[in-house]
């Protein structure tokens, strides 16, 4: 195979004897390992399980493993003040009080260190009022309640049912409507599929069930008392009132037993519409406040967790390249846990162990990778993916220099169904050909390839034929390297038949029950869909750090930059007349468009027609693949988001799980009509255009000829 | 120079189908999403549908979706509105638009009993 040419290693050293060498059983035994008490960022068991897998990675064989600590910003709840939510009466008596913790799963009754549900970084606060349901507190959910339904948000307690969108914007929204405490609960609607029973008898959410996680707005910052800089021993800290995301309001959240409490006695408006109704037992009203009956009942919240700056570590590990050490392939995903990481993050953890494995195994038996390949263990993430961005932080000079790509490694499940894959287009050619290569693991499609079943079940809604890839949001470790950076990124895992619930996560998602039994269980009893997620993850990583010609195909980027210009101007041209006042022109972006495909084109044949024997034009065609997806990165970055630096792809700024194209021409015409300076607002589209159209023109020029 | 040439328009009664056509010339026409925008007499204009690089990527207004359909053909160089169940509030001057700025002269469009 010509992977080997460069690096003088015997034949049978290529993918193949790296993927035979990845086994279910220890991925099975290493999720079993990983999975027996809780990790929460900045407890001493996670500085543990951190110093377990250095370790391990040394004896596995890799060249150098170290762990980089930095000190950040975490929150806790306080231990002797426990956070809870009351109904209470006329004269301020409790009536009604949330749980104070999930009852723990079997077996895991006397294990000590389970964090109670709470929301992370949310304030102190005590604020009692009436309650206005307010749907998912998406964007539009919101226009629905203010401006179509005239309900004032505005020193209430809002109640929103978890699914579609990322947490931390929903309580920005909450905020932004004038609300002065938010109650995050999981609806069986969108957390209790049909048919199937709860945990610990099936992968249900039972009613006492609670989903954690932060609810910052970070966009890409990291540690919110040192944007931009490594929190580092010599760091300066902003104070807490400048800090970065925080939210204003307290927050907490409960299961869908403790909501239907709530809920059950909501009265003043319907429902608008059928959109908002959940599966429990309730009008599901949106208030303001209760009904007839209860009308003097109030809520009130008692939330009294604690920010802290806090000690987190990464685990970093290095296998050097024969032939180009200079030059990173980097597989990072996250250790820490809410509780005790079943899924999220161990499956993944267990993945890339077993990936670190099979590499050192050829290592110790005389192979080493064309390129250095760098392995992460990153703390944090689930408070607002702090190790990965301070350590992106610290190397930031390295890695864009140097950085060919980030492959993540998170949860490698959310269901059994198919695979799915969000990456840069750059790699949608290396995905195809990896997936045609591996045998799926699915039933109905034995013999046949990853690549068949997953088109068959995930097909592309634009090209027959093909599988659906989606476009890279955020909400996990790779937004510093692709948002930030501009290193080419990708993720994949196996997912659900559950298109509608994209966002939702699956039903046991941040609760104690996500358990190693879980997984074992009700997910992949023989894991053999974590080993088709390793090959997938390790495959792409092999391939990345061996070819002699990176795998990067820049014509795929050129298909999708006219279809993300052609969606953008037919948003824009919804609005004929101002587009017409105000001279709103996309000609430079579509001919910027034009230009970047001739010249993918003709790059792509030169590609062909290069002597590979001769080591310099090699690596300047490399370093052309390797800088495309740096080309796209504006210095400045995105109006009031300089850590999203991305052109053409951002978080979305009404859901971080999503990813959408020109962000910044998107964001400036989004909600347009409504603006009260229309001149201004479409000389910011136009504005956008402009840089939209520089961007793409000036990537298309870097794969020309060099001279 | 970018011309941009409708035909198609005329009277016809409600239920009716027309089919609009608009000539491009000036410009490499597979290159550039394409719009038809309308006018009802005395009213502001209002986005009907676009159509980007092939006829796999469309959209359309909501008071049109169903009954109207955008396509185009690169190797002539033209785009089409196939409209059909024809209502009396789809009067209007039909407007072909190429990247927001260059605009046809349109074409009338009467649905009348």
């Known amino acids: 195979k010509s992977s080997n040419e460069a690096t003088n290693i015997t034949p049978k050293h290529n993918m193949k004897a790296f993927l035979d060498e990845l086994k279910a059983e220890n991925i099975k035994k290493f999720l079993y390992n990983f999975t027996q008490i809780p990790h929460l960022a900045g407890t001493e068991q996670n500085f543990q399980l951190a110093k377990q897998i250095q370790s391990q990675w040394k004896e596995f064989g890799l060249d150098s493993v170290e762990l980089a600590h930095y000190d950040v910003l975490l929150s806790y709840p306080n231990k002797t003040h426990p956070n809870y939510i009351s109904i209470i009466n006329e004269d301020g008596n409790e009536i009604f009080n949330t749980s104070l913790f999930e009852p723990p799963p079997p077996g895991y009754e006397n294990v000590s260190d389970i964090v109670p549900p709470f929301s992370a970084f949310s304030p102190q606060g005590m604020p009692e009022g009436d309650l206005v349901y307010v749907n998912y507190a998406r964007t539009e959910d919101f226009f629905k309640l203010e401006r179509d339904m005239k309900i004032n948000c505005s020193g209430k307690i809002v109640i929103a049912r978890y699914g579609k969108v990322f947490r931390g914007n929903k309580v920005k929204n909450a905020q932004l409507a004038g609300a002065k405490g938010v109650i995050l609960y999981s609806d069986p609607a969108d957390y209790f599929a049909p048919g199937v029973k709860s945990y610990p008898d099936g992968w249900n959410l039972p009613g006492g069930g609670v989903q954690r996680g932060n609810i910052l707005n970070l966009n890409g910052a990291g540690d919110p008392l040192t944007p931009g800089y490594p929190a580092n021993e010599y760091a300066y800290r902003r104070g807490i009132a400048e800090a970065v995301g925080l939210p204003s309001i307290p927050v907490h959240p409960i299961g869908y037993y403790d909501a239907q409490k709530l809920l059950e006695k909501m009265g003043g408006s319907a429902p608008p519409d059928s959109s908002w109704r959940g599966s429990l037992k309730v009008p599901y009203n949106v208030g303001p406040g209760f009904t007839g009956n209860f009308s003097t009942q109030k809520v009130k919240m008692h939330i009294h967790s604690t920010n802290e700056v806090t000690r987190i570590y990464n685990v970093i590990g290095t296998l050097r390249g024969a032939v180009e050490p200079d030059r990173y392939v980097i597989l990072g995903g996250h250790r820490d846990s809410w509780v005790f990481g079943g899924i999220d993050p161990q499956s993944g953890a267990a993945v890339v162990h077993e990936i670190v494995r099979s590499f050192g195994t050829l290592k110790k038996e005389g192979w080493r990778p064309r390129r250095t390949i760098l392995f992460a263990s990153w703390d944090a993430e689930e408070f607002g993916l702090l190790g990965s961005t301070e350590w992106a932080e610290e190397n930031s000079r390295l890695l864009q220099e140097r950085g060919v790509a980030y492959i993540n490694a998170d949860s490698s499940i959310e269901g059994n169904y198919t695979l799915r894959v969000d990456c840069t287009p750059l790699m949608y050619s290396l995905v195809h050909n990896l997936t045609k290569e591996l045998k799926s693991p699915d039933e109905g499609f034995e013999g046949k390839s990853l690549y068949e079943s997953w088109t068959k079940k995930s097909p592309s809604p634009e090209f027959s034929g093909m599988p659906r890839i989606s476009k890279l949001g955020s909400g996990n470790d790779f937004e510093v390297f692709f948002q930030r950076l501009g290193i080419a990124s990708g993720r994949a895992r196996y997912t659900k038949n559950w298109e509608t619930n994209k966002f939702s996560g699956y039903p046991l998602y941040h609760s104690v029950y996500e358990t190693y039994e879980l997984v074992e269980k009700f997910y992949d009893p023989m894991f053999k869909y974590h080993l088709t997620v390793a090959q997938v993850r390790g495959g792409m990583v092999f391939e990345l750090a061996n070819s002699i010609v990176l795998p990067f195909d820049c014509r795929d980027y050129a298909v999708v930059l006219r279809k993300y210009a052609d969606k953008i101007y037919s948003i824009s041209m919804k609005h004929p007349q101002e587009m017409k006042t105000y001279s709103v022109s996309f000609d430079s972006l579509f001919s910027a468009v034009k230009n970047f495909t001739e010249i993918a084109s003709k790059f792509s044949e030169r590609l062909q027609d290069f002597d590979k024997s001769n080591p310099i034009v090699l690596r300047m065609m490399n370093d052309q693949l390797m800088f495309l997806e740096r080309a796209f990165i504006d210095p400045l970055g995105l109006p009031d988001r300089p850590f999203y630096r991305h052109v053409i792809y951002a978080p979305s700024s009404h859901n971080k799980y999503a990813g959408e194209s020109f962000p910044g021409i998107y964001d400036a015409l989004f909600d347009i009509e409504s603006k009260v300076d229309p001149s201004k607002a479409w000389g910011e589209v136009k504005r956008q255009i402009y840089v939209a159209a520089f961007t793409v023109q000036a990537a298309a020029e870097t794969l020309s000829e060099v001279a | 120079e970018v011309q941009l040439l409708e035909s198609g328009g005329g009277l016809v009664q409600p239920g009716g189908s027309l089919r609009l056509s608009c000539a491009a010339s000036?410009?490499?026409?597979?290159?550039?999403?394409l719009s038809w925008v309308r006018q009802a007499p005395g009213k502001g204009l209002e986005w009907v549908s676009s159509i980007g690089e092939n006829n796999a990527t469309t959209d359309y207004a909501d008071a049109v979706k169903g009954r109207f359909t955008i396509s185009r053909d690169n190797s002539k160089n033209t785009l089409y509105l196939q409209m059909n169940s024809l209502r009396v509030e789809d009067t209007a001057v039909y407007y072909c638009v190429k990247d927001g700025v260059h605009w046809g002269q349109g074409t009338l469009v009467t649905v009348s009993s």
């Open positions: 000036g410009f490499s026409f597979s290159s550039y999403a």
